[in-house]
């Protein structure tokens, strides 16, 4: 139990969010971080994994409504599966209908997240900024 | 002490953020919420105050770097003082130099926050979305 050393009391009118890696954004008990350095999709995925996180997974417009105001384009954890035509997340789950508008802008098998729940198809080797996400239990 | 009823243990490798009002964004122990409904500056201020918060105050590019990726324009707590020509926050503090680029788009005494630390001057009676902020102790 040596890793645990903080004991806090929380007022019922407010709540703590997390736990998250230090200096990450916490929202509705999910942790998010935006990374400025441009990497390709695979490097972005590796960077998130090295921080016990994954690339952004969009699973709910309600729980993730902070994403609608995100500026610019960032890698998320969505990839195209050529053999069945579906889009799936890193965890193997299939993209739910009506969650993202997939925009056919570039020829590629990865997707960039853009504001208002849009996903722009992009070549996986193109460098871009990226969003990591860690779901709290 | 009746309002306090949760006791949590936090791993040193991660941390909790807050406390914040329920479902607000927590980042570096500040709480933020984006409101979709358009209100004039005074109504926006009143809305934030009713939630024990104030309109957004920008005080640090480092501590508030999440703001650089915010899309669109939102009321913040910055007002122009005609008598001395300065811009000040709701708490009376003066806008620090080099924190915001003030852009004179409209004639007005209030300011909208826009991505990359820009402030757009706007008429205080114009309806806009707004950002509330609560600084944790």
């Amino acid at each position: 139990n040596s890793l645990f050393n903080q004991e806090v009391q929380i007022p019922l009118t407010e709540s703590y969010c997390g736990p998250c890696p230090k200096n990450w954004i916490c929202y509705k008990n999910n942790c998010y971080q935006f990374f400025d350095e441009s990497k390709n999709w695979y490097e972005s995925q590796a960077s998130c994994m090295s921080q016990n996180a994954s690339l952004l997974k969009v699973y709910s417009k309600e729980d993730q409504d902070l994403l609608k105001l995100v500026k610019s384009y960032h890698w998320m954890g969505l990839v195209h599966i050529p053999t069945n035509g579906s889009w799936q997340w890193e965890d193997g789950s299939i993209l739910s209908p009506n969650l993202l508008t997939i925009i056919e802008m570039q020829k590629g098998d990865c997707a960039l997240y853009a504001s208002s729940f849009k996903g722009y198809i992009e070549n996986c080797s193109t460098p871009n900024t990226y969003i990591c996400m860690q779901r709290t239990v | 002490n009746s309002l306090f009823n949760q006791e949590v243990q936090i791993p040193l490798t991660e941390s909790y953020c807050g406390p914040c009002p329920k479902n607000w964004i927590c980042y570096k122990n500040n709480c933020y919420q984006f409101f979709d409904e358009s209100k004039n500056w005074y109504e926006s201020q009143a809305s934030c105050m009713s939630q024990n918060a104030s309109l957004l105050k920008v005080y640090s590019k480092e501590d508030q770097d999440l703001l650089k990726l915010v899309k669109s324009y939102h009321w913040m707590g910055l007002v122009h003082i005609p008598t001395n020509g300065s811009w000040q926050w709701e708490d009376g503090s003066i806008l620090s130099p080099n924190l915001l680029t003030i852009i004179e788009m409209q004639k007005g005494d209030c300011a909208l926050y826009a991505s990359s630390f820009k402030g757009y001057i706007e008429n205080c009676s114009t309806p806009n979305t707004y950002i509330c902020m609560q600084r944790t102790v």
């Epitope: 195209h80 050529p82 925009i103 020829k107 | -």
Partner: antibody, heavy 121, light 107 residues
């Protein structure tokens, strides 16, 4: 890369017809195949699409109402459109089309030559 | 379903003219709009995808713009081979829908 269509012709009202489209020069089982029709002197109307791979996922226009069925044969690199209970309103040129890239499903840069279906007694 | 309204339905123009065709969607389609050219007896040909991206091999006199619900196809200097019918198509969501078409005729 091309799409070669077959199967059009004259059919009586109430009859059925199967239109097919063979893809060559590309990996058929990684692409969506779409069908679009155009009545004489009218505009383009999307019918539906099917994925050429193992899933065979389909989407249809809301007006189709089960009269049209999409299928595909991976081994033959062929997509087909079965049209049942034909009426005069189904008289049209029928096109198959393929998206510009395998991850696309809604933007078409490769088209078949079209096949005419005439419904008349 | 998303309705696509194209205007005008036909227009007469001369070689060298600048031609503008508009397309309005019944809801925001997030720049997911394609433009096709069709000549009599031929299959449609993709000109512009994602509202403003020029398809490979298409002359640069064709351009697309727009966002939200309103989109425009512009031919900067009409050439003899451009007399045809033009269709917009929303690529935002299934079911896919086309505009009614704009026939560009010789004045």
């Amino acid at each position: 890369q091309q799409l070669e269509q077959s199967g059009g012709g004259l059919v009586t009202p109430g009859g059925s017809l199967k239109l097919c489209c063979i893809g060559s020069g590309f990996d058929f089982n990684t692409y969506w195949m779409t069908w679009v029709r155009q009545a004489p002197g009218k505009g383009l109307e999307w019918i539906g699409c099917i994925h050429g791979g193992s899933s065979g996922s389909t989407y249809y226009a809301s007006w189709v109402n089960g009269r049209f069925t999409l299928s595909r044969d991976i081994d033959q690199s062929t997509g087909c459109l079965q049209v049942n209970s034909l009426t005069a309103a189904d008289t049209a040129m029928y096109y198959c089309a393929r998206p510009g890239y395998r991850s696309w499903s809604k933007t078409f840069d490769l088209w078949g030559q079209g096949t005419m279906v005439t419904v008349s007694s | 379903d998303i309705q696509m309204t194209q205007s005008p339905s036909s227009l007469s123009a001369s070689v060298g003219d600048r031609v503008t065709i508009t397309c309005r969607a019944s809801q925001d389609i997030s720049e997911s709009l394609n433009w096709y050219q069709q000549k009599p007896g031929k299959a449609p040909k993709l000109l512009i995808y994602a509202a403003s991206s020029l398809q490979s091999g298409v002359p640069s006199r064709f351009s697309g713009s727009g966002s939200g619900t309103d989109y425009t196809l512009t031919i900067s200097s009409l050439q003899p081979e451009d007399f045809a019918t033009y269709y917009c198509q929303q690529a935002n969501s299934f079911p896919l829908t086309f505009g009614g078409g704009t026939k560009v005729e010789i004045k």
